[in-house]
C-alpha cells in the first residue's frame, strides 16, 4: 500500500436540490473520507447542527479503491427547512494518521433567494425543415442555483429533453435553458407542451409555462 | 514542506478551440506538473508529435505553491492543421522523486466531425414587460464539442452575452445556447444583432445568424 | 412502504355525481404530480388528468372528454387526492387508478389497485 503522509482528505457535500424541495424525499449531508490507510483504517465522524452536536447520521461500511486505500462515508439526515432556513453543518473526522481533527462545513448557498423567471421558445423558422424541433425553456434570474426542470405535455412526462447546467448570470443571478426534442409533426398539429420547474422561491415551489403552435398560447 | 512520497503528478491541456480555428492564433498544449518538492525541483520535458521527438517548446520558470510545492509549466505551440488532423501530443516528464518518466498524451476528440446547425430565438413576448430582454442562439448538432461562440451587433463586439458550455445530445452530438442580454429599447428599435460561431465543420470554420425585430430577419 | 389506496367507487345513474378518493402513505401527495387514470373492460388504460406538486391548481390538467366534468382536488392535512366527477355518463363505467409521479421521472412510479365506478343507464 502507498504510504500517505499527507494523511486522509475530507469532502462535504450538500443534499440534492429536488431532497430538499420535496417533502416526502430524504435530504441528506454526505461527508466522504478519502485515502485513509491499512496502517489506520478507524475514522471517527462527529456531526454538528449549527454548532451543537448531533447523533443520528449513519456510517457506512469502508470500502476498499483500487489503489489500496480506504473510502468511509457519513450520511445525516436534515430536516428540509433547516436546509432552506441556512443552517450549517459540520462534519468533524478524527483518524490516527491526522494531527488533529478535520472539521468540513457546509449550508445552503447564502443570501436572497430569488424568483426564477421562465419564458418558453418555440422552434426557429430555419429549423422546420428538419424532421425534428427543438423547443426552449429559459429559465433565469433564480437564486440560488437549486433547481429542477422537466417537460410534459398532455399532463404526460416527456423524457428527450436535456437541461444545461446553471450558470452565473451577470447580475449575480443564474439562468439555464432546457431544450426538449420532438418530431416536427407534434409541434405542427399543435400540441401543447409545458416545462415545469421547481425552486424554493416560487409559490407553492412550482411553476409551469406552456408552448404550442396555436398563437396566444 | 510537506513529503510527498507519491511524487509529482502531471496534467495535459489540449489547445483553445478558437486558436484552433483561427489562423492568426496560436494554439498551443500545456503540460503542468505538480506537487513538485525542494528536495527535487528539477523538471525535464520531453516533447513528441506522432512519436516524434520535436524541440520547440518553452519551459516556464518554475512557481512556488502556497503548500511549498512547485509547478512547472511546459508549453508546446502546435500546427492548426495538425492537430484539426488528429495528431497525437505527448509529453514525457521526468524527475528524481519519480521511478520512471511521466507519459501523458493528447489529441482532438476523435470520431466525424459534424456541423453544428445555429438557429437565433427571439425573446419571448412574456419578457417584454422587462427592461432588459434575452436574445437565445442555440447551437446544435455539432461534433467535436470544440466550438467558440460570441455576439455582434453593427460589427461590434457585444459583451453581455453567456454561453452554456456544451452538452451532449441523445443523438451523441452536442448543444449550446448562448443568451445575449439587451436593452429592451436596443431591441425595439430594430437594431441587428449576430450570434457568430466557430467550428471546425463549418464552411470556412465560421457562420453567423442575425435576429432582429421585424420579421424576415 | 409506499401504497395509494383508491376508495369511493360504486353503482350511479347517467347524469349523477360521485367522488372518489385516493389516500397515499409513504410519500406526501404535495410533492408529486398526482394523476387519475382509468381502464375500461377491454380498452387500453386512458388517462385522466393530474395536479402538479405544490399545493394549488393553477396547473391542473384534464383530457378533452372529461374537462367540465371532472376535478381533481387535493387534502394535505389527509394526504389524499380526490377525483370529484359530476354529469357521469355511460362510458365513464371503468376502473379508477390514482398514480403518483416524482419529479424529473419519465414513468409514472406509484399505482393504486384502483375502484370500480360503473354508470348504468
Known amino acids: 500500500a502507498p504510504e500517505l503522509l499527507g494523511g486522509p482528505s475530507v469532502f462535504l457535500f450538500p443534499p440534492k436540490p429536488k431532497d430538499t424541495l420535496m417533502i416526502s424525499r430524504t435530504p441528506e449531508v454526505t461527508c466522504v473520507v478519502v485515502d485513509v490507510s491499512h496502517e489506520d483504517p478507524e475514522v471517527q465522524f462527529k456531526w454538528y447542527v449549527d454548532g451543537v452536536e448531533v447523533h443520528n447520521a449513519k456510517t457506512k461500511p469502508r470500502e476498499e479503491q483500487y489503489n489500496s486505500t480506504f473510502r468511509v462515508v457519513s450520511v445525516l439526515t436534515v430536516l428540509h427547512q433547516d436546509w432552506l432556513n441556512g443552517k450549517e453543518y459540520k462534519c468533524k473526522v478524527s483518524n490516527k494518521a491526522l494531527p488533529a481533527p478535520i472539521e468540513k462545513t457546509i449550508s445552503k448557498t447564502k443570501g436572497q433567494p430569488r424568483e426564477p423567471q421562465v419564458y418558453t421558445l418555440p422552434p426557429s423558422r430555419e429549423e422546420m425543415t428538419k424532421n425534428q424541433v427543438s423547443l426552449t425553456c429559459l429559465v433565469k434570474g433564480f437564486y440560488p442555483s437549486d433547481i429542477a426542470v422537466e417537460w410534459e405535455s398532455s399532463g404526460q412526462p416527456e423524457n428527450n429533453y436535456n437541461t444545461t447546467p446553471p450558470m452565473l448570470d451577470s447580475d449575480g443571478s443564474f439562468f439555464l435553458y432546457s431544450k426538449l426534442t420532438v418530431d416536427k409533426s407534434r409541434w405542427q398539429q399543435g400540441n401543447i407542451f409545458s416545462c415545469s420547474v421547481m425552486h424554493e422561491a416560487l409559490h407553492n415551489r412550482f411553476t409551469q409555462k406552456s408552448l404550442s403552435l396555436s398563437p396566444g398560447k | 514542506a510537506p513529503e510527498l512520497l507519491g511524487g509529482p503528478s502531471v496534467f495535459l491541456f489540449p489547445p483553445k478551440p478558437k486558436d484552433t480555428l483561427m489562423i492568426s492564433r496560436t494554439p498551443e498544449v500545456t503540460c503542468v506538473v505538480v506537487d513538485v518538492s525542494h528536495e527535487d525541483p528539477e523538471v525535464q520535458f520531453k516533447w513528441y508529435v506522432d512519436g516524434v521527438e520535436v524541440h520547440n517548446a518553452k519551459t516556464k520558470p518554475r512557481e512556488e505553491q502556497y503548500n511549498s510545492t512547485f509547478r512547472v509549466v511546459s508549453v508546446l505551440t502546435v500546427l492548426h492543421q495538425d492537430w484539426l488532423n488528429g495528431k497525437e501530443y505527448k509529453c514525457k516528464v521526468s524527475n528524481k522523486a519519480l521511478p520512471a518518466p511521466i507519459e501523458k498524451t493528447i489529441s482532438k476528440t476523435k470520431g466525424q466531425p459534424r456541423e453544428p446547425q445555429v438557429y437565433t430565438l427571439p425573446p419571448s413576448r412574456e419578457e417584454m414587460t422587462k427592461n432588459q430582454v434575452s436574445l437565445t442562439c442555440l447551437v446544435k448538432g455539432f461534433y467535436p464539442s470544440d466550438i467558440a461562440v460570441e455576439w455582434e451587433s453593427s460589427g461590434q463586439p457585444e459583451n453581455n452575452y453567456n454561453t452554456t458550455p456544451p452538452m451532449l445530445d441523445s443523438d451523441g452530438s452536442f448543444f449550446l445556447y448562448s443568451k445575449l442580454t439587451v436593452d429592451k429599447s436596443r431591441w425595439q428599435q430594430g437594431n441587428i444583432f449576430s450570434c457568430s460561431v466557430m467550428h471546425e465543420a463549418l464552411h470556412n470554420r465560421f457562420t453567423q445568424k442575425s435576429l432582429s425585430l421585424s420579421p424576415g430577419k | 412502504q409506499v401504497q395509494l389506496q383508491e376508495s369511493g367507487g360504486g353503482l350511479v345513474q347517467a347524469g349523477d355525481s360521485l367522488r372518489i378518493s385516493c389516500r397515499a402513505s409513504g410519500l406526501t401527495v404535495n410533492d408529486l404530480y398526482m394523476g387519475w387514470f382509468r381502464q375500461a373492460p377491454g380498452k387500453e388504460r386512458e388517462f385522466v388528468g393530474r395536479v402538479t406538486p405544490g399545493d394549488n391548481t393553477d396547473y391542473t390538467y384534464y383530457v378533452d372528454s372529461v374537462k367540465g366534468r371532472f376535478t381533481i382536488s387535493r387534502d394535505s392535512a389527509k394526504n389524499t387526492v380526490y377525483l370529484q366527477m359530476n354529469s357521469l355518463k355511460l362510458e365513464d363505467t371503468a376502473v379508477y387508478l390514482c398514480?403518483?409521479?416524482?419529479?424529473?421521472?419519465?414513468?409514472?412510479?406509484?399505482w393504486g389497485q384502483g375502484t370500480q365506478v360503473t354508470v348504468s343507464s
Open positions: 398514480a403518483g409521479r416524482r419529479f424529473g421521472s419519465s414513468e409514472w412510479d406509484y
